[in-house]
């Protein structure tokens, strides 16, 4: 897979492949994988990709199911890159506060908060 | 501060306090704090709260600015709790795939993806 494929297109393709191979993937009825109990997905990327690793090791490879796992690996690479960018730029307090305000604003409006 | 305050109310109050104390917080003109370079805030909670810690250590405490940092500490506690819930429940592959599909769907529609 060319890594030049835009991440947004990669995600779309992966969703389609996930749907295509669902029957094959759920064939192992005894396998149990940790599933987050909330919908703030970004907090759980580590566990999600650990789960994908478990699933891959239990799935017969070949054909486009390999492409699915390759895609998921590229998505992980993208997210790892984003995580690296969390502390890259050292900025004035002013800018940190603007980012913090935006973070809390998003938390206020978009997060699924269970108290 | 009673920890029983709903997290959503806590976030709202913290936004207000952040605005109130902005001038005091930015008084240190030479301080530099890492600022994430993207808007996928949930990926960067660790760095954000490290930054808050740096800011707190450089800010003269007293009055409601203390309440601001206490609130932020409670928000961190909430997020840490959410992170613990990422791997708590072991579920069938079927259920993991549902979560994965939802994660990719959210990534597809809501994440800010720069390729």
């Amino acid at each position: 897979i060319p890594t030049e494929i835009p991440t947004s297109a990669l995600v779309k393709e992966t969703l389609a492949l996930l749907s295509t191979h669902r029957t094959l993937l759920i064939a192992n009825e005894t396998l149990r994988i940790p599933v987050p109990v909330h919908k703030n997905h970004q907090l759980c990327t580590e566990e999600i990709f650990q789960g994908i690793g478990t699933l891959e090791s239990q799935t017969v490879q070949g054909g486009t199911v390999e492409r699915l796992f390759k895609n998921l690996s590229l998505i992980k690479k993208y997210i790892d890159g984003q995580k690296k960018k969390c502390g890259e730029e050292r900025r004035r307090v002013n800018q940190f506060l603007d980012y913090l305000q935006e973070f809390l604003g998003v938390m206020n409006t978009e997060w699924i908060i269970e108290s | 501060i009673p920890t029983e305050i709903p997290t959503s109310a806590l976030v709202k109050e913290t936004l207000a306090l952040l605005s109130t104390h902005r001038t005091l917080l930015i008084a240190n003109e030479t301080l530099r704090i890492p600022v994430p370079v993207h808007k996928n805030h949930q990926l960067c909670t660790e760095e954000i709260f490290q930054g808050i810690g740096t800011l707190e250590s450089q800010t003269v405490q007293g009055g409601t600015v203390e309440r601001l940092f206490k609130n932020l500490s409670l928000i961190k506690k909430y997020i840490d709790g959410q992170k613990k819930k990422c791997g708590e429940e072991r579920r069938r592959v079927n259920q993991f795939l549902d979560y994965l599909q939802e994660f990719l769907g959210v990534m597809n529609t809501e994440w800010i993806i720069e390729s």
């Epitope: 890259e88 730029e89 050292r90 900025r91 004035r92 002013n94 800018q95 603007d98 980012y99 305000q101 935006e102 604003g105 | 001038t23 930015i26 008084a27 003109e29 030479t30 530099r32 600022v35 994430p36 370079v37 993207h38 808007k39 800010i112 720069e114």
Partner: antibody, heavy 117, light 109 residues
């Protein structure tokens, strides 16, 4: 390498609104590490900061221009814009857009705007 | 609001040292940035955070800042250094950017 390019009319009539757009290439305007700023320079004079905007929409304006200035951002086009209302001949200047981290990192080449009837 | 004062002009012979000052109330507590601007071009950062040079800027350019004065020093001045030089700080009480009025450096030929 981030590049910025100003565009807009070079001539504006007095009392009208000056509108300029800055297109960012080689980087994303959604980069939370930067503010996006406008600066102007009257002929033969020093630099004058007009204002800046954060990706979230937070804006900061020069107090002397605040009542007439609006800066906005369009992340889908990777652009940000300046509007300066009720212009007079005193607004004739070279207008620069720039990215602003801890300092002004990248600048456009500047565009001369003349206010004249 | 915060004000920065620069001399309108400084003249120096090639090979000599030029010093351009930037005055402001307690400027030593702020970080100062210096920009070089040649005719018809956009400004270029030559010193940031009082005394740090961006990559590509010759070692001849240096800065200092204390008390009420920041100084940009250009040693072994060359003809190509002739330009306008502006200082800049942040006014933290308002989150505003402040520029000095600029200093024209003339290299005497």
């Amino acid at each position: 390498q981030v590049q910025l390019q100003e565009s807009g009319p070079g001539l504006v009539k007095p009392s009208q609104t000056l509108s300029l757009t800055c297109t960012v290439s080689g980087g994303s305007i959604s980069n939370a590490g930067y503010y996006w700023s406008w600066i102007r320079q009257h002929p033969g004079k020093g630099l004058e900061w007009i204002g800046y905007i954060y990706y979230s929409g937070s804006t900061y304006y020069n107090p002397s221009l605040k009542s007439r200035v609006t800066i906005s951002v369009d992340t889908s086009k990777n652009q940000f814009s300046l509007k300066l209302s009720s212009v007079t001949a005193a607004d004739t200047a070279v207008y620069y857009c720039a990215s602003l981290g801890n300092w002004f990192d990248y600048w456009g080449q500047g565009t001369l705007v003349t206010v004249s009837s | 609001s915060y004000v920065l004062t620069q001399p309108p002009s400084v003249s120096v012979a090639p090979g000599q040292t030029a010093r351009i000052t930037c005055g402001g109330n307690n400027i030593g507590s702020k970080n100062v940035y210096w920009y070089q601007q040649k005719p018809g071009q956009a400004p270029v950062l030559v010193v940031h955070d009082d005394s740090d040079r961006p990559s590509g800027i010759p070692e001849r350019f240096s800065g200092s800042n204390s008390g009420n004065t920041a100084t940009l020093t250009i040693s072994r001045v060359e003809v190509g250094d002739e330009a306008d030089y502006s200082c800049q700080v942040w006014d933290s009480s308002s989150d505003h950017v402040v520029f000095g009025g600029g200093t024209k450096l003339t290299v005497l030929g």
